[in-house]
Structure formats: C-alpha cells, structure tokens
C-alpha cells in the first residue's frame, strides 16, 4: 500500500509569493511559493494519485505583515482552503499567547492541530480541551495512518505560552502516544512534529512504531540528487534514521517559507512496515502557475494589509538615525531602538534566578536601511520600518561562547573607517574600543548584562562562559564576515520577523525617544 | 457696597483631609483642610455674610490617588456641593488631555470655568465652544461683579493641552475681555488666574480696570500678622499693588492644598472703585468640625479607591531595589525607573529644534523608602507605590543653571558613605565621582543629555547655560540640605503627584526591567 | 461520469430570494471550484461567482455582489446560490459549472443543465 | 478586469467552409508560455460545452476540424471544415485571472 506525503513547515506568514530568498517578490516571472502556487501542485498530485496526505509541521504563524495584521485567522482560512489533513504546533503558533492561538486556529481550522508534549493544566485545561490533541487517525483510502504531534521544548523560551501549558520532553510523550495507536490497530503511524533536525532523528531513533517522521524548525534542506535553488542540502531526502530496534525510518524536512512542497511516497506491506521510500522536495517555482482563484482570495485579503502599512503604530519625538554614517560608525539611536524591542520581544520571565533568559542584542550596522524623520508629525508607519529593515529577516535566538562574542566584536571594527556593515549596533552590551590597537585586539572593555540576577546590571564578558543572544537570522548564517557565529554557535532559535518586533514594540511604547547614550565607545 | 471673597487654589486633589504637611492624614485629630471642613467654614461665612463669592484659582486636578482614579469627576461633584462661583483654569486641568478636561469638569460643573488667555482652534474649537469662558458677570445681591480668567501661558510645557488650544500672553487677552466688561457696565472686576504670583502682580499693575487679582500656580502664602502654622509668609494678605494708573490693586493666593480658605473683603464705592481690603487666610484645622455629610459623600467614594490600591499596574520582572544600601550609595534601578518615568511624564515635543524641552532628573536617595520584590508573581500595585514614595510629594520642573546642577552633584557625594539621603539618582545624566578629592571637587564628569538635538546624546555640562531639570517638589524647597537648588533656582513650576507619575509610566510600559546601567560611576 | 443536476426551474415574484442548487456526481466535489454563470435570453455569458467546497473560499464578480451568495454542502455535494432582492433584471438561465485546473487551462469543463429563474409579478 | 471582444457578432458560412472567430483581451492573457483562453460552443436550449482550452488544446471529443490559435491577447478560433452541426454561438473566455469574463459570443450560421 503506497502512501504520498505532502509536508510543509516553517511557512512562516508566506501567503503571497516570494523571491527566491523567501522575501518580498520583487519580480513575479521568478518568484516562488505562496498558497495559490501550493494549491495548484497540490491538487495535481491529488488528481494524480490515490492516497495522499498534506501535512504541516508548524510555525505557519510569524513572518511577514499577514500575520501582524490578521494574527492567524489566514492562516486558518488558506489551509482549510488548501485542505490539509494535519498540523503540528510550532512554537511561533503561541507568538500572540495561547489565546492567540485558540481563537482564530484551534478553532476554525478544519484539520486536526496535534501535539503530545504540551499538556495544559489550571484553568486553560477545560478550555483548551479538545482543540488539539495528542494524536489523530485519518482514513487514507481503505487504510488508516496515525499522526502524532510534537513540539519544541524550548517554546517558554521561544514564545509566549503561557503559564498553563507544561512543555514536555518530546520523546517521554510520544512513546505513550504511540503504544497507544497500536492498541487501535493503527500500524502506520508518522510523528509529524516541530523540534528541530536533531529531535527529529532521536524520535526516529528512540520512539518504537513510529514509521515515518516529519519534522520541522530547523528549516532543514534535505534534497536526493541536484538541488533546484540554492538551498545546500544536510544530506539525502528522505534522510534514513536506523531506530534502536532495527527499522529504517525515513526523515523529512522540507526548508521553510512555503518554498518547496515535500513530496514523499512511502511503501508499506500489510503489517504497517515500511517496505520502501522516496520522494524529493518539489520546488514551487513559476513554472507551476497560481491557482488564479486562490489568487485573486489572497487578493481580498491583501487590501486590509495595504491599509495597515500606512496607519500610525506610534510616534518618536526624535530623529531616527539610521543613517549609514552613523550606524557604520558609532552608536545609532535606531540601532538602540531596534535592539531594545529585540530585547523586549524575548522577555520570558520563566526562573526566579534569572530576570530574564536573554539580556544581549547584536545588529550589524549595515541591516539599517534608512532613517525615519520626526518631522513627520511624529509619525511611525510599517512602511516605514520596511524601508528601516527591508530584508525580510527573523531576530532570532543564539547560544554563543563568550569567546565568539569577543571575536564578533573584534570583527565588528577590524576594518572600521570604511562604511562596511559589520560595525554592530547593541543592547544590553557596553563595549569600548581602541581604534589605534591592531585589527583582531581592538576591544579594551565588553560589559554585559547578567541574566542570573534579580538587579540587571553589567559585568565584563566570560570566555568561556555561554550567553544568549538576540541577532539578525542574517547574522546567525555568518553574514557579513561574522563566520565564527556560524561556526561556533551553540545553538540557533529562528525568531519573529524583524519589522515585526520593531513595530510591536513601538505601538506598545507608544511614543519612543531613543538616545545615543554611550552603549558603544571609543577610548 | 462690601464684597467677602473666599478662595482656594492649588488644592491638587486634597478632598480627605490631610496632616499639617498636606500628605496623608495620619492623626485626625491634627488633620487640616479637605472638602467637608471647607463646607463647614463657607457655610459658616456664607450664613453671616450677605456678598459672598466662593472662587478657585486652579489647579483642582492631580496630587492624590483621588484624581488617579476619578480623573476630575470628584472635583466636579464636590466642587458643585461646596457651590462655587466659579474657577479660573490652571495647567494640571490639561493634565489628561482636553477630553480628560471636557468630559469630567467642563461638562458637569454647575459653576463657569475661565480663561481669557486660552484660545481653541481648528476641531476643537467648535466642541469646546461655551464649555470654558473668556469671563462672566455673576450677580451679588444688588450688584453685579466680573470674573475674567487667565491660566499660564507655560501649559504646554507643563500639561497636555494637545495642539488645538493656543495659550496667549496673559496681559494682551485680559485687557479687551475687560474693556468688554466695562462696556457692558460692569464696573467690579476680578481677575481669576492660574500664572503664579509675580504674573498676578503684573496683572494688578497693567490690565486697566481690574480691582482684584485672585491668584495660584506658586502656593504662594500672604498673611498679616502670625501665621498659624508652618507656612512662612511671601508678603501681607492681600498684596497691595499700585497700577500704572495709579489705583492700589489687592492680590491675593491661599498656599495649596486647601490647608486654608483665602478670605478676602473688599469694600467698593459707588463707581466700583476699591476703597479698603482686608482679609486673612483661614487655617481649616480641627478647630472646625468637618460637616458629617460631606464626610458620609467621600467616604462612599472613598471605597473605590480602596480597591485600586490594590490592583495591579503593571509588573516587574527584575527586583526593584529601593533599598538604603543601594539608593543611597550607588545607581539603583528604583531609581532609575522613577527618574525614566519622570521623563516621560514631562515629553512636550512642541519646538522642532528640540526633541524636548527636559531630558534631566535627579532625584535624593533617600525619597526612595522602600524596594519592590519582583517574586509576587512581579505585581506592582499603587499600595507597593505609596511605600517607595510615602510623602505625597510631586516631580517638578525647575530651571537651574549648570554652576547650581554641579553644586548639586557635589553635595550628592560631600558626605558619602554614611547612608545619607542626599546621594542623588538620576536619568539624562552620566556622572562620575572620584572619592578620592576632597569634598566640593568630587564630580570629575558630568555630562547631560541635550535637549536642543534631533538625535538625544551626551555632552558635557555647561556651567553658564540654563537648564531644565525635573526633580521632587522637596529638592526644588532646599531639602536634603540641597540649599543652592532653592537658593539658585531661575524657575519652578509644581508638577505632577510623584506616586501617579510612576504609576502611570508602569501602567504603560506594562512589563518592566530597569537595569543599572552606569549613570553613576565612581573612578 | 462527471455530472452536475441543478434544481428546476422557479418563478418568483420581485423582492423575493430564491436558491438554486447544483449537486456534483462523479468527481471528488472538494476537489474542484464550482462557478456560477448567468445569461439572460438571447444575451452573452456573466461570471457571477465561485466557491471551493470544503473550504471558506468564494470569490464574487462586484456586480453580483450583494445580490448572489454561494455556498456548498459537502456532505451532499450540493452547491448553492440564493439570490435576493430579486427583479426582472435577474430572470435568466443560471448554469453552474465545474471549473478545471492549470492542466486544462482553467476552463470550465463540465456545465449543468441550466435553471431557469423567471421573475415577474 | 479583463475586457473580452470578440468579433464578428455573427457570421454565415457555406458547408465545408471555414470559418474563423477573433478574440481580443484588453490585456495579456499569457503565464510563462501558456494562454489562459478558453473557446465553449453553446447551442439552444443547451449549456455551454468546452471546446479547446488554453488557446489550442482540444478537449477530448471534439473533432479535429475545432482549433485554436494566439497568444497575449488575440486569439482566434477556426473550424474547417464547417459542418450542419457547428451552427451555435460561440464563446471565448480568459481564465488568466478572476474575475473570469466571456466575450460578447457569435453566432455561426450555416448556408
């Protein structure tokens, strides 16, 4: 019996159709993704073949102005247009609090929202009761398939669950799960799930009946023969995880941004084993048209988004300096502002010993656009912030060395003078540099602020210590030189849309004054 | 033909009686003024005296939990119980914004609100129109006397009275609206106001045709003979003026608070020219029975007040250390959220060249009485409030110049070390101390954040220019042995309750985090 | 066998609604957009609107807004439209269509018979 | 929206004849390398039937002596030779992008 798997994740509010790098289609004869081209494939290979299932695992919520805006309740609409069979939940689906998720997912979505890690006590309990669950068995043909949800650990962290959801270690979870669908009789069970390349290979390792799994978070690329864009792959799709008792359990991942359709067909005998399997990541490329009428909804949706762009979300009584003369040189107030509400956007107060998990931004200079004027009235616009950060990116989560942190700040001015991007902008970091030192041994003082203490307040950076950071996804990947982040992190979160965060952050301040106020300075 | 005028101004939510000092009642027995002993001595006039006009000066709005809560509601209501004859506007009406002004007091006090000097224009003006006059004409007994209005021209830097109202100069708007009076045969004119006590005596001296000014906004105390109580007298009650047209003009203020009730009469010939005036303040101490009803109203409104104190503002996710050990020797984060919060409570960004017109606050140490633990689920109720700031005092706005500010921050440290309250925190401010130098030559760097800049950064502090700082109402009075600030002070406008400022900065900001962040080094 | 059975014809008097149903055989209903097209005697074709069953999807022509509201059963296959506020100007043959795919050009590839909507008092 | 005209409003062709129907859209009806026009063929008392979709592809039934041909926005519709039964009026559509619109239709008689 021949079973085709259809899986996206990490889609990320990219309803519309993309560039080639997930951000803003610019030119529509090479841009990619979006619902109306998913749909069209979709459908085809649902017209094509027998048993089929279109799976998600996670983060749909979080990433561009359509989430800001309609805050999951089109995120619920598309895929109940596009008929998906199942959901994960991904962390980013709490962005907005377990509310934010209840209300326009949980319950107006017409598929089944799955994970058996996340267990809901107090008062949440009854209400949340039923709107997702730990596991779900869906008739494919004459043939039952059994999914089993996971998600991400580290979502207290990541998100804003709250203080009612218990996040449980995944594998302790779904055991149980599991055992429980082969007492039904169910013998093709997939975890379908959002906790990263790694977790998923453990499950496939360590969790017994799981046949198939189908994973999220980690925007693995996974691709068998030569890639179709330029995403590197992390090794053969589907990726063959050797379960401690012996089975051969495909793994798959299908990158993020609604990019590529994962496409697996698997082969079972009539036991539930699985005999074989092959597929590859379809690339969603304009070869494949829109589904003009997909289309032309998304184009009903859009009006509300147009609007939005142009409406006030605050005001500043200052100059927003963003200019390249400044933030490729010194301290930009604009560069503050942005790294406070990256700051602001991480608070998770989960341990009495910490204040907070995270107390440190890092921004290179180069990823600030454009100023803002005050002389505007005040005015404070998404069009303006995407003209501020027009790129697209998430400010994400990463464990660095304080060792890493050093060399990224020696990095930061190791060919300073030239009006090159790397300079970096902060929070919650007071660095002084000696400029007449040589290149590589410029930092004469890196203060940070603690997070295990009750007073926030600054002390001089560890080597060897481990910190947290908030940063641009731009930096996380190594860009603009910044290799020894890539290289040396410890670990790497993918975060909320940059625009995102900054408009959050004003709209909640309401009014901002943002000053240069000897976060970065020279001895 | 005799005129008895009683007047208050600057009563600053004072309606529960309050101890000598015009903070909270603690002993009954030693309590002064408040709404029911106020009724008490007006009826008390009233009933014996046949002309009798009951008028405010201003400045009704803010200085207790009572306005933070009705928001101008309990003024009118108790003021048109006490049947005043009406009340001449002052900055702090502006306070919530002309809607907190409209709605509470312009529309529902029975008496009529005046300002000559304030002039609405565009939406504004049409809603607003008849809601506050220029002046009025009030009949008394056989006569008929003239009440014109005037509010300080300071307002916008002071309050918000938003865009849409204009605040001219006091003595260019009261002429015509006199003149008018004067054509219409009113020839018993008073001059009701809100600019302090040097603009009322100017008033006195250039506006032809006015016979008294009543004046508030500088707590002013006139009194003839001994004084009461503490109150040191600026001058004889009333203040003989000699106009430019050569006629003696009595002006008078009754301090605040509604410690006292001004008493002035006048008697006027036959042409409405003032023959004699004489009068004294009234001290409302206990010697006058508070009236039972009056007392049995605010007792019923007194319950919701109760409850807000209790309530949750916002939280904290960090320990808000108050404590002696840290104010009183070092940066605290107590201190720094109460002097961020007295910054943002005085943004009035009403000149392009200036982002605006404050960006300093110092604040003693030991006016911090107490910490905030964050590990009660981080709740911060005005209860927890009232604990750090005890005293009922307000944040002001003074003008100093940078030789005064340099003599504050030397007397900050004079004496360090032993636990004194002097030690000044600060926001707007980086300095630095060497302990090491003698006493008066301890402050080695000083820098101050501009104001006159698009972009707020640091520079040195200037010894010869003018600054504007916010600081307690106790430092801008000399407390703390803070001598030159009283001494030197070039301006000083009373501004808003200290715990209602930080309050509603929590409120705001919802979710706080003050760090120590090296305002405050010691080289 | 692709087939989709609309509803007989009706007479309705002005003002009135009326809703008219198209039920699909032979194909999976969820699978496809249903289209809804009107054509007064003698006269052209005018898209009025469409709806993908299963889902909240429906895209309307403006001109037919307000006056025509699509929905679908999928446990019948049944779509319908209800048209309201009805005047002469709505008697006409009301077909509903199937429409196809990127592989058929988008057209609509298989029609019903037709409903005759008369409106007259 | 997308404006279709389709010309001539009627035309009368001889048995075995050809005859040739004119589409114009107002804009291009084209996506990488397709046209999105469709031709339907409807006769009294009857539905719509699809006839060639995507400009030239023939649905499966209908005779060879149907075609189609354009691309951007003029499209034209042959049949050669005409037979008794192709009397009918005949509609192009575009289904480039929604709103979907028909041209005004012509009607084919036989002589």
């Known amino acids: 019996w021949e079973l085709t798997i259809l899986h996206t994740n990490d889609v990320h509010s990219r309803l519309e159709q993309t560039s080639e790098d997930s951000s803003k289609c610019v030119n529509a004869s090479r841009c990619m993704g979006g619902v109306a081209r998913l749909f069209t494939k979709v459908q085809q290979i649902r017209r094509a073949e027998p048993n089929v299932l279109l799976l998600d695992a996670g983060d749909q919520y979080q990433g561009t102005i359509w989430f800001t805006v309609y805050k999951g309740a089109e995120v619920a609409h598309f895929m109940n247009a596009l008929r998906y069979d199942a959901m994960a939940l991904g962390n980013h689906e709490f962005d907005n609090g377990v509310e934010g998720l209840i209300e326009p997912l949980l319950k107006e979505a017409k598929f089944p929202i799955l994970s058996a890690n996340i267990k809901a006590k107090g008062p949440l309990a009854s209400q949340i009761s039923g709107l997702y669950l730990p596991y779900k068995v869906l008739p494919v043909g004459d043939e039952v398939v059994g999914i089993v949800g996971y998600t991400s650990k580290e979502t207290p962290f990541l998100s804003n669950p709250g203080t009612n959801l218990v996040f449980e270690d995944e594998i302790t979870a779904l055991q149980p799960e599991v055992d429980k669908l082969k007492t039904l009789n169910v013998n093709k069970i997939i975890a379908l799930g959002h906790s990263g390349f790694e977790m998923d290979k453990l499950i496939a390792q360590k969790v017994r009946g799981v046949d198939v799994v189908v994973g999220g978070h980690s925007n693995t690329f996974l691709y068998t023969g030569n890639p179709p864009s330029k995403e590197v792959p992390a090794g053969k799709y589907p990726f063959i995880v050797t379960s401690d008792d012996g089975r051969k359990v495909p793994v798959v991942q299908a990158y993020a941004f609604g990019k590529y359709l994962g496409y697996l067909k698997i082969e079972f005998d009539e036991r539930g084993n699985v005999i074989s399997s092959h597929g590859n990541p379809i690339l969603l490329n304009s070869s494949i048209p829109e589904d003009p009428s997909i289309k032309a909804d998304i184009n009903k949706w859009r009006i509300k988004l147009d609007n939005y762009s142009t409406q006030e979300l605050g005001k500043t009584i200052v100059y927003l300096d963003g200019s390249s003369q400044s933030c490729r040189f010194r301290e930009c107030n604009m560069g503050n502002l942005i790294c406070d509400a990256m700051i602001n956007n991480n608070l998770r107060h989960t341990d009495e010993m910490f204040w907070n998990h995270v107390s440190m931004c890092i921004l290179n200079g180069g990823g600030i656009r454009s100023p803002i004027d005050e002389r505007n009235n005040g005015t404070i616009t998404w069009e303006n912030l995407a003209a501020v950060l027009p790129f697209g990116g998430t400010f994400d989560l990463v464990q660095l060395k304080g060792s890493t942190l050093k060399k990224a700040f020696e990095h930061s001015v190791h060919r300073y003078g030239q009006s090159t991007g790397e300079f970096l902008q902060v929070g919650g970091i007071h660095v002084v540099y000696d400029l007449s030192r040589k290149p590589g041994d410029r930092v004469v003082k890196l203060d940070v602020l603690c997070t295990k203490c009750r007073v926030p307040s600054y002390d001089p950076l560890k080597m060897d210590e481990v910190y947290k950071v908030i940063l641009p996804n731009f930096l996380a990947n190594g860009g603009d030189g910044f290799q020894m982040i890539k290289d040396e992190l410890l670990r790497h979160d993918s975060g909320d849309q940059d625009i995102n965060v900054v408009s959050t952050y004003i709209s909640k301040m309401k009014v901002i004054y943002p000053a240069v106020e000897g976060r970065i300075k020279f001895s | 033909w005799e005129l008895t005028i009683l007047h208050t101004n600057d009563v600053h939510s004072r309606l529960e009686q309050t101890s000598e000092d015009s903070s909270k009642c603690v002993n009954a027995s030693r309590c002064m003024g408040g709404v029911a002993r106020l009724f008490t001595k007006v009826q008390q006039i009233r009933r014996a005296e046949p002309n009798v006009l009951l008028l405010d000066a201003g400045d009704q709005y803010q200085g207790t939990i009572w306005f933070t809560v009705y928001k101008g509601a309990e003024v009118a209501h108790f003021m048109n119980a006490l049947r005043y004859d009406a009340m001449a506007l002052g900055n702090h009406e502006f306070d919530n914004g002309v809607e907190g002004l409209i709605e509470p007091l312009l529309k529902e006090a029975k008496f009529p609100i005046l300002s000559a000097n304030i002039k609405a224009k565009g939406p504004l003006a049409s809603q607003i129109s008849g809601l506050y006059l220029p002046y009025k004409v009030l009949p008394v007994g056989d006569e008929v006397v003239g009440i014109v209005g005037y509010t300080s021209k300071e307002t916008p830097f002071l309050s918000n009275p938003g865009t849409n109202l204009v605040f001219e100069d006091e003595i260019t708007a009261l002429q015509p609206e006199v003149d008018k009076l004067k054509t219409l045969n009113v020839n018993k004119i008073i001059a009701l106001g809100h600019s302090g006590f040097e603009m009322d005596k100017l008033i006195a001296q250039k506006v032809r045709g006015v016979d008294v000014v009543v004046g508030g906004h500088s707590n002013t105390f006139l009194y003839t003979g001994n004084p009461p109580s503490k109150e040191v007298p600026a001058g004889k009650y009333p203040f003989i003026v000699t106009s430019d047209d050569g006629r003696k003009v009595p002006v008078v203020q009754a301090y605040a608070f509604g410690k006292y009730l001004g008493y002035l009469k006048i008697e006027f010939d036959e042409r409405g020219n003032v023959i004699s005036s004489h009068g004294n303040p009234i001290l409302l101490n206990s010697s006058i029975p508070e009236d039972p009803s009056i007392k049995a109203d605010i007792n019923k409104w007194r319950i919701k007040l109760d409850n807000y104190s209790t309530q949750e503002l916002g939280k904290t996710i960090v320990y808000l250390d108050g404590s002696s050990q840290s104010c009183r020797f070092r940066e605290c984060n107590m201190g720094n959220l109460i002097c961020d919060a007295m910054i943002n409570n005085n943004l009035r960004h009403t000149d392009e060249m200036f982002w605006n017109h404050v960006s300093m606050c110092i604040l003693n140490g030991g006016g911090i009485r107490s910490p905030i633990d964050e590990r009660n689920n981080g709740t911060i109720t005005w209860e927890n409030l009232a604990a750090v700031l005890p005293f009922g005092g307000t944040f002001d706005l003074v003008q100093l110049k940078g030789s005064t500010l340099k003599k504050a921050f030397e007397h900050s440290v004079h004496r360090y070390g032993q636990s004194t309250g002097e030690f000044l925190q600060v926001g707007g401010i980086h300095v630095v101390y060497d302990l090491s130098r003698k006493p008066g030559d301890r402050v080695v760097k000083l820098d101050v954040l501009c104001t006159k800049c698009r972009v707020p950064s640091y520079d040195p502090l200037k010894m010869d220019e003018v600054y504007k700082v916010i600081l307690p109402n106790f430092l801008a009075n000399g407390g703390d042995g803070f001598q030159m600030i009283k001494d030197e002070l070039l301006r000083h406008d009373s501004g808003d309750q200290d715990i209602n400022v930080v309050s509603t900065y929590i409120s705001k900001m919802k979710v706080i985090y003050p760090a120590v962040e090296g305002r405050i080094k010691f080289s | 066998e692709v087939q989709l059975k609309e509803s007989g014809a009706e007479l309705v008097k002005p003002g009135a609604s009326v809703k008219i149903s198209c039920k699909a055989t032979?194909?999976?209903?969820?699978?496809?957009?249903i289209e809804w097209v009107k054509q007064r005697p003698g006269r052209g074709l005018e898209w009025i609107g469409e709806i993908l069953p299963g889902s909240d999807i429906t895209n309307y022509n403006e001109k037919f807004k307000g006056k025509a509201t699509i929905t679908a059963d999928t446990s019948s296959n049944t779509a319908y439209m209800q048209l309201s506020s009805l005047t002469t100007e709505d008697s006409a043959i009301y077909y509903c269509?199937?429409?196809?795919?990127?592989?058929?050009?988008?057209?609509?590839?298989?029609w019903g018979q037709g409903t005759s909507v008369t409106v007259s008092s | 929206d997308i404006v279709m005209t389709q010309s001539p409003a009627s035309l009368a062709v001889s048995l075995g004849q050809r005859a040739t129907i004119s589409c114009k859209a107002s804009?291009?009806?084209?996506?990488?390398?397709?046209?999105?026009m469709n031709w339907y063929q409807q006769k009294p008392g009857q539905p719509p039937k699809l006839l060639i979709h995507?400009?030239?592809n023939l649905e499966s039934g209908i005779p060879a002596r149907f075609s189609g041909s354009g691309s951007g926005t003029d499209f034209t519709l042959n049949i050669h030779p005409v037979e008794e039964e192709d009397a009918a009026v005949y509609f192009c559509?575009?289904?480039?992008?929604?709103?979907?619109?028909f041209g005004e239709g012509t009607k084919l008689e036989i002589k």
């Open positions: 032979g194909y999976t209903f969820t699978g496809y957009w």
């Open positions: 995507a400009a030239s």
């Open positions: 269509a199937r429409r196809g795919y990127d592989e058929t050009g988008y057209a609509m590839d298989y």
């Open positions: 559509q575009q289904s480039k992008e929604v709103p979907w619109t």
């Open positions: 804009q291009s009806v084209d996506y990488d390398g397709d046209s999105y």
